[in-house]
Interface confidence: low
């Protein structure tokens, strides 16, 4: 349906303060770099404008897209220049080769400090002072930090951050009431980015196509009682909810993502008898709610797939009369089935039967050729579960920190080209898989370790893609999505690789370290770990071990001592020497 | 999005007729083969009937043999099930459904022989 002001009928839909939320979170994931003033300003000027189109469509530059209208104002910005460099040429495109510019300049990784936290009655007297300044900063911040932080999303976000100062900044000790949530909400978000940036990835890099693939087997899973037509429509809908936040249009993406909970609301019947507790929430609140909803108990009733997938003399003409949805149909049956598989494992499993259809539809009999196919899934089901198997026992042996350094010793040895920080972070996130599904029931392990790695991973594969250095870590990223996670698992030792020369001054420390919270002293000893492999690629795990023992009995004795600064300074090089001669 | 609704249903006496229609959208009609399959109360999915995406190619269950007829109608994406001489053990809801799969991807329409 067609407006005669985009612009105007958006701020209908959503309201004043969804609006600028959302305008704020847009221009803020394009310019990264501007400060929080200038955003407000560009802000507030086009929520003027859209006030003077709701009175008037007609009135002048109305009738512009959205992407006109942003990407006007946004160019309008004094120092584009000086702080974006290349950026600034966008300006000089027309719609649409200009929003294509601005998104392909997004930067995953962009050169901003850490957030610090300010002490709590800070915090609350801004957030006293002014309401309005404090969440549209929180808006601004997180935007900046994750430009394809989903948008409608991250205002529910903004209603949580708001919730949590409003009742604890009344309580009788604001910090132990506000830090934990503080703390729940930075973490959320940080998953929250993550899984987002897979869907964008997927989008962008494999097309819609892949991700409809993907929505198909989660969605199957979720709502197992619904028909298949009932699926492809919430599989369409989704795509184009995401399609739109991915491409930078948030305003069109909160619009249709409100259509999607109230269309799903009133249709609960044919979805899932789980969506009841979350159709009486509001809009924000609901759309998070059914995003999150648990899988729906699978029908009683369902028949063996074997009939009409393996069984049937129709298989080839049913697939080559409609490859696509005979396919969708093949995964939507299986997915449903199975809610304890992975979602990347449903689609290797799709991808495995379109393979030997192919094969077989072309041969002299093609019934003989495929009446196998079921089998040849064994190894590619086993390969997950092992794996999940495996890692499960080893964390449960060592602790988070220490599978956290087996992981980082593994990677660090299959891609040592990779930037340390990259390395350490991206073995981390790895690493908290152990905490995050180990101790789930075994039917909910494989789904919760495997798609939450193939997120990880994907944050390995954007920050490679901005500064490629491997192409190993090249070639799992973009031949295939559903076998990024394998493609990783099965790299072993880069016998190639020219170990880095050592450098002193990369393992000498000082008495800040410890100052340091408990977190920041594992990153330093993480770092100091992916060091000492790309150094030594072939050291065994026992050397390693010997080597990191010493470290922290280093930093303790350093930081028990009187003068910490004359301790590292003496023990220090005597830890590097003895290192060198244990790696020797 | 794919949609399948189904038409035609009713209540009708032994050796009468009916004809169901089911009406499809959001892929391309004329490029797919098409089945009837029907689901008796308490039992599972039973295929009765399938179409080429031409229409020159059907097959029948044997129960429906001599009795039914599946044809379509491309322009208008329409699929039909002529059915004469009804018995009480074709009471079932029928729904149409893509290629020969029995999986059921609609509502469907309530077909009911009884006197």
């Known amino acids: 349906d067609t407006h005669k002001s985009e612009v105007a009928h958006r701020f209908k839909d959503l309201g004043e303060e969804h609006f600028k939320g959302l305008v704020l979170v847009a221009f803020s994931q394009y310019l990264q770099q501007c400060p929080f003033e200038e955003h407000v300003k560009l802000v507030n000027e086009v929520t003027e404008f859209a006030k003077t189109c709701v009175a008037d469509e007609s009135a002048e530059n109305c009738d512009k897209s959205l992407h006109t209208l942003f990407g006007d104002k946004l160019c309008t910005v004094a120092t584009l220049r000086e702080t974006y460099g290349e950026m600034a040429d966008c300006c000089a495109k027309q719609e649409p080769e200009r929003n294509e510019c601005f998104l392909q300049h997004k930067d995953d990784n962009p050169n901003l400090p850490p957030l610090v936290r300010p002490e709590v009655d800070v915090m609350c007297t801004a957030f006293h002072d002014n309401e309005a300044t404090f969440l549209k900063k929180y808006l601004y911040e997180v935007a900046r930090r994750h430009p394809y932080f989903y948008a409608p999303e991250l205002l529910f976000f903004a209603a949580r951050y708001k919730a949590a100062f409003a009742e604890c900044c009344q309580a009788a000790d604001k910090a132990a009431c506000l830090l934990p949530k503080l703390d729940e909400l930075r973490d959320e978000g940080k998953a929250s980015s993550a899984k987002q940036r897979l869907k964008c990835a997927s989008l962008q890099k494999f097309g819609d196509r892949a991700f409809k693939a993907w929505a198909v087997a989660r969605l199957s899973q979720k709502f197992p009682k619904a028909e298949f037509a009932e699926v492809s429509k919430l599989v369409t809908d989704l795509t184009k909810v995401h399609t739109e936040c991915c491409h930078g249009d948030l305003l069109e993406c909160a619009d249709d993502r409100a259509d999607l909970a109230k269309y799903m609301c009133e249709n609960q019947d044919s979805i899932s008898s789980k969506l009841k507790e979350c159709c009486d929430k509001p809009l924000l609140e609901k759309s998070h709610c059914l995003a999150e909803v648990e899988n729906d108990e699978m029908p009683a009733d369902l028949p063996s797939l074997a009939a009409d997938y393996v069984e049937s003399k129709d298989v080839c003409k049913n697939y080559a009369e409609a490859k696509d949805v005979f396919l969708g149909m093949f995964l939507y049956e299986y997915a449903r089935r199975h809610p304890d598989y992975s979602v990347m494992l449903l689609l290797r499993l799709a991808k495995a039967y379109e393979a030997t259809l192919e094969k077989c539809c072309a041969a002299a009999d093609p019934h003989e050729c495929y009446a196998k196919v079921f089998d040849e899934f064994q190894p590619l089901v086993e390969e997950p579960q092992n794996l999940v198997k495996q890692n499960c026992e080893l964390f449960e042996q060592l602790g988070e920190y220490k599978f956290q350094n087996a992981l980082l010793v593994r990677y660090t040895k299959k891609v040592p080209q990779v930037s340390t920080p990259t390395l350490v972070e991206v073995s981390r996130n790895l690493g908290k898989v152990g905490a995050k599904c180990c101790k789930l029931p075994e039917a909910k392990r494989m789904p919760c370790a495997e798609d939450y790695l193939s997120v990880v991973l994907n944050r390995l594969c954007v920050l490679h893609e901005k500064t490629p250095v491997s192409e190993k870590v090249t070639k799992c990223c973009t031949e295939s999505l559903v076998n990024r996670r394998p493609c990783f698992s099965a790299l072993e030792l880069d016998e190639a690789y020219v170990p880095k020369a050592f450098n002193a001054e990369t393992f000498t420390f000082h008495a800040d370290m410890c100052t340091l919270s408990e977190k920041e002293k594992q990153v330093k000893k993480q770092t100091a770990l992916v060091e000492l492999v790309k150094h030594k690629p072939k050291a065994t795990k026992e050397q390693l071990k010997g080597v990191m023992d010493n470290f922290a009995a280093f930093v303790e004795k350093c930081c028990k001592a009187d003068d910490k600064e004359a301790c590292f300074a003496e023990e220090g090089p005597k830890f590097v020497a003895a290192s060198q001669a244990a790696l020797a | 999005q794919v949609q399948l609704v189904e038409s035609g249903g009713g209540l009708v006496q032994p050796g009468g007729s009916l004809r169901l229609s089911c009406a499809a959208s959001g892929f391309t009609f004329g490029r797919f083969g098409m089945s009837w399959v029907r689901q008796a109360p308490g039992k599972g999915p039973e295929w009765v009937s399938a179409?080429?995406?031409?229409?020159?190619?059907?097959r029948y269950a044997e129960s429906v043999k001599g009795r039914f007829t599946i044809s379509r109608d491309n322009a208008k994406k329409t699929l039909y099930l002529q059915m004469n001489s009804l018995k009480p053990e074709d009471t079932a809801v029928y729904y149409c459904?893509?290629?020969?799969?029995?999986?059921?991807g609609s509502q469907g329409t309530q077909v009911t022989v009884s006197s």
């Open positions: 179409i080429d995406s031409g229409g020159a190619d059907t």
């Open positions: 459904t893509i290629g020969r799969s029995t999986s059921r």
